[in-house]
């Protein structure tokens, strides 16, 4: 659950985030699991720890292995594992499956290919894009921030897309590449204003103090592939990750599902070891897409333990 796969190519930069998160003020220690040897924090090292991030600048095949991160606060320690694999660069153009990030789909009207993991790096535009190793040229291709937009998508646009950028660390530049497949869906879909299925508006969810609780934000957005659709949680009207309560975590990915042919997204909020103060918070489920934003709210109430008499 708190283990994450990461991969990279030799002689490229690789930055890995600890799967366990906490306040920025919490210290994070990194270890190489096989030897239990501490990873240094001094930036002069090729491999060093920088808070929640583990940096390989650049990576070497020998760096492969499992790394342990321990988030330390005054009251608790939390452990996560990063399973890192560094591969040799391929001489030919084919990108093997094990180097591929998740596949994305596009349609004639909407096509966005995000550059995977780029948010972890200190990069500056322009981002370079390649399809099957060929640099993309022409007015149909637009590199915008961390994604590529393809105008008037055709079935021939399907393929493997690689983004290439430069990570800067203290004046030194390191190359990074990441590849994902793009598929083209030829379907007559449509998009609707988000419809939130869960939680119900003003829902009150019963929880037990000391136990774990899950809240699901679920919304549907139309039929077929949806673009710029998202569901997310807010805590007291602010971003979950910045609220500063590591017991309350939003799942990393959004689960896509289909309900009566409609495209829906779910986002789970996990509350570990529910405390009294959690009952005072407001949990907002936000669903948004090109049409607009909609919000539902849920509060927690204490579940009264039922006496079981024989």
């Amino acid at each position: 659950k708190f283990s994450k796969q990461s991969w990279g190519l030799e002689n490229e930069a690789l930055i890995v985030r600890c799967p366990r998160q906490g306040k920025p003020s919490y210290t994070v220690d990194w270890y190489y699991s096989q030897t239990n040897k501490s990873i240094p924090t001094q930036e002069r090292n090729r491999v060093f720890a920088s808070g929640q991030l583990l940096k390989f600048l650049p990576a070497a095949v020998a760096d492969s292995g499992i790394y342990t991160c321990i988030v330390r606060s005054p009251t608790f320690n939390r452990t996560g594992y990063a399973n890192v694999t560094i591969y040799k660069k391929q001489s030919d153009c084919n990108v093997p499956d094990y180097l591929m990030y998740s596949t994305v789909s596009g349609s004639e009207k909407n096509s966005k290919i995000y550059c995977p993991t780029i948010d972890l790096y200190n990069w500056t535009a322009p981002l370079e894009w390649f399809k099957n190793c060929q640099a993309l040229q022409g007015s149909r291709y637009r590199a915008h921030k961390s994604f590529l937009v393809i105008d008037n998508v055709m079935t021939e646009d399907a393929g493997d897309y690689t983004c290439k950028f430069i990570h800067n660390e203290n004046g030194a530049n390191y190359s990074v590449t990441a590849t994902r497949s793009f598929t083209v869906k030829d379907e007559q879909g449509f998009s609707l204003f988000p419809v939130i299925g869960a939680p119900a508006q003003n829902e009150i969810k019963e929880v037990e103090i000391g136990k774990n609780a899950n809240l699901t934000c679920s919304a549907c957005f139309g039929k077929g592939t949806q673009f710029l659709a998202a569901v997310l949680w807010q805590l007291n009207g602010t971003k979950i990750t910045d609220f500063g309560e590591p017991r309350i975590q939003q799942e990393e990915g959004q689960n896509q599902s289909f309900s009566n042919g409609l495209a829906c997204l779910d986002m789970v909020l996990r509350i570990a070891d529910v405390k009294e103060e959690d009952l005072l918070l407001q949990y907002d489920c936000l669903a948004l897409n090109l049409h607009g934003l909609r919000r539902h709210t849920v509060r927690l109430s204490r579940k009264n333990p039922i006496d079981h008499h024989s």
Epitope: F193, N202, L228, G237, K239, D242, Q282, G292, R294, R295
Partner: antibody
Framework: EVQLLESGGGLVQPGGSLRLSCAAS????????MHWVRQAPGKGLEWVAV????????YYADSVKGRFTISRDNSKNTLYLQMNSLRAEDTAVYYC?????????WGQGTLVTVSS | DIQMTQSPSSLSASVGDRVTITCRAS??????LAWYQQKPGKAPKLLIH???KLQTGVPSRFSGSGSGTDFTLTISSLQPEDFATYYC?????????FGPGTKVDIK
């Protein structure tokens, strides 16, 4: 203390452009959605636009869609409103505001006058 | 889009009076409703959020009620500093919309 300070207002001719800025301080700017709201002289409040924490999601009132662009620079704790193709009916005091499921803090506003 | 209506559009009252302002949404908005007070030349000030919750620092004579489509702002005993214009706003769904306002002035 939460502070929002708008600037960039002034007199502009119809069809012209103006860029408003809002400097935020006293809170974690990048953790909040942010709004622009306007008020024409002697009239009520009109919501203009909202932007998500990282700027990836933006929504507009129909009256400004296609003409106004909301943006933000989290490294500078600043919110922007780029206003193009301005019309006389855009004359108003423009407020920048913080979202917490409602608007809980407002700036003092900056006056935009569109007139020939 | 969700339309917000307020009534009355204006009212005259005396210090000590109980004042009630209503706000109606054209469709259900749950409790995503806020009330603001605005005085001439000033920015609006948040009074009530989530339909019923008093914003920190706001006097307890202000209260909010309702959910769904019908909402009420009540001032239990009007004070001289309460003469102002009051707006409701829904934040359930974009475009977020304000009511046209209710002006409370001295009788």
């Amino acid at each position: 203390e939460v502070q929002l300070l708008e600037s960039g207002g002034g007199l502009v001719q119809p069809g012209g452009s103006l860029r408003l800025s809002c400097a935020a301080s006293g809170f974690a700017f990048s953790s909040h959605w942010m709004h622009w709201v306007r008020q024409a002289p002697g009239k009520g409040l009109e919501w203009v636009a909202v932007i998500s924490y990282d700027g990836s999601n933006k929504y507009y009132a129909d009256s400004v869609k296609g003409r106004f662009t909301i943006s933000r620079d989290n490294s500078k704790n600043t919110l922007y409103l780029q206003m193009n193709s301005l019309r006389a009916e855009d004359t108003a005091v423009y407020y920048c505001a913080r979202d917490r499921g409602m608007i809980d803090y407002w700036g003092q506003g900056t006056l935009v006058t569109v007139s020939s | 889009d969700i339309q917000m209506t307020q009534s009355p559009s204006s009212l005259s009252a005396s210090v000590g009076d109980r004042v009630t302002i209503t706000c109606r949404a054209s469709q259900g908005i749950g409790s995503w409703l806020a009330w603001y007070q605005q005085k001439p030349g000033k920015a609006p000030k948040l009074l009530i959020h989530a339909a019923t919750k008093l914003q920190t620092g706001v006097p307890s004579r202000f209260s909010g009620s309702g959910s769904g489509t019908d909402f009420t702002l009540t001032i239990s005993s009007l004070q001289p500093e309460d003469f102002a214009t009051y707006y409701c706003q829904q934040s359930y769904s974009t475009p977020f919309t304000f009511g046209p306002g209710t002006k409370v002035d001295i009788k």
